[in-house]
């Protein structure tokens, strides 16, 4: 009955500080309302990076000031995190909640280790 959430183990952010990964969940029921949250875990401290609630069949929308964007297709969510820097390297956990109809289900992925390398500054040209 538990909800399983799958996500890649490792992702390398682009030189522009953008990382994308797929979060896939096995829904035990016919959910119509789903909430997806990206959490960052560092030294056993967990913080929320971003969250979005969406109706199945509709697009998922994060708040305007969010560093995340995403699209949904069935039980898959394609997540993109922007504005990452080397200090943001860490474990990013996908959390999925089936909010409606009852019962409520919680699903937590094992996390994606996102590596971010700050680009070298361009050398000055004479």
């Amino acid at each position: 009955k538990a909800m399983h959430v799958a996500q890649p183990a490792v992702v390398l952010a682009s030189s522009r500080g953008i990382a994308s990964f797929v979060c896939e969940y096995a829904s035990p029921g016919k959910a119509t309302e789903v909430r997806v949250t990206v959490l960052r875990q560092a030294d056993s401290q967990v913080t929320e990076v971003c969250a979005a609630t969406y109706m199945m069949g509709n697009e998922l929308t994060f708040l305007d000031d969010s560093i995340c964007t995403g699209t949904s297709s069935g039980n898959q969510v394609n997540l993109t995190i922007q504005g990452l820097r080397a200090m943001d390297t860490g474990l990013y956990i996908c959390k999925v909640e089936l909010m409606y109809p009852p019962p409520y289900y919680l699903g937590i992925g094992n996390g994606t280790q996102i590596y971010v390398i700050d680009p070298e500054p361009c050398p000055d040209s004479d």
Epitope: V46, E48, A51, P103
Partner: antibody, heavy 118, light 108 residues
Framework: QVQLVESGGGVVQPGRSLRLSCAAS????????VHWVRQAPGKGLEWVSV????????FYADSVKGRFTISRDNSKNTLYLQMNSLRAEDTAVYFC???????????WGRGTMVTVSS | EIVLTQSPGTLSLSPGERATLSCRAS???????LAWYQQKPGQAPRLLIY???SRATGIPDRFSGSGSGTDFTLTISRLEPEDFAVYYC?????????FGPGTKVDIK
């Protein structure tokens, strides 16, 4: 610091109503689901209800469904439990608890006692 | 609903001894959604373990959790005087969230 403080308990007759409150502080209230859990005298813990985030999604134990209503006011950082048609078996200490980001109940209030007796 | 059963009901031990508490679920529970709480008389419960094996903030390392599927264990490696209390397991992966009936650890 992060804390939850319940209030509103008391002695009430069977069939009457009572409203409990839980004031939250020290964290972003709207980012968390919050629960009510109760404990009858000398007994174990019983989950009662949860309300998620913006307050649109609520879930209840069968024992209170149709009689209790959970709500929240995110602008006041406060959780509520409206208890109607109270029965003797509702006598318990009522705790509010925060559902952590990974799901377990990481912060608890000290509880408020509700006694239903004629 | 998922029913949790705890054993033994009471565990009588001396300080310094090892305590092993069991929690069994009526159906499979993902280890991601199994927690243990400690409660002392007149106090609120305190989260000890989440995700079956992760210690909550500030919990000493003498407390450890393990298990998967339907069988979970809380181990206290060396009982300290402050560890004598009631311990509850809980599943939080599906509503209704359920608690076990508790195991009381008392002084022998």
């Amino acid at each position: 610091q992060v804390q939850l403080v319940e209030s509103g308990g008391g002695v009430v007759q069977p069939g009457r109503s009572l409203r409990l409150s839980c004031a939250a502080s020290g964290f972003t209230f709207s980012s968390y689901g919050v629960h009510w859990v109760r404990q009858a005298p000398g007994k174990g813990l019983e989950w009662v209800s949860v309300i998620l985030y913006d307050g649109n999604n609520k879930f209840y134990a069968d024992s209170v469904k149709g009689r209790f209503t959970i709500s929240r006011d995110n602008s006041k950082n406060t959780l509520y439990l409206q208890m109607n048609s109270l029965r003797a078996e509702d006598t318990a200490v009522y705790f509010c608890a925060r559902g952590a980001l990974l799901g377990a109940f990481d912060i608890w209030g000290r509880g408020t006692m509700v006694t239903v007796s004629s | 609903e998922i029913v949790l059963t705890q054993s033994p009901g009471t565990l009588s031990l001396s300080p310094g001894e090892r305590a092993t508490l069991s929690c069994r679920a009526s159906q499979s529970v993902s280890s991601s959604y199994l927690a243990w709480y400690q409660q002392k008389p007149g106090q609120a419960p305190r989260l000890l373990i989440y995700g079956a094996s992760s210690r909550a903030t500030g919990i000493p390392d003498r407390f450890s959790g393990s298990g998967s599927g339907t069988d979970f264990t809380l181990t206290i490696s060396r009982l300290e005087p402050e560890d004598f209390a009631v311990y509850y397991c809980q599943q939080y992966g599906i509503s209704p969230f359920t608690f076990g009936p508790g195991t009381k650890v008392d002084i022998k």
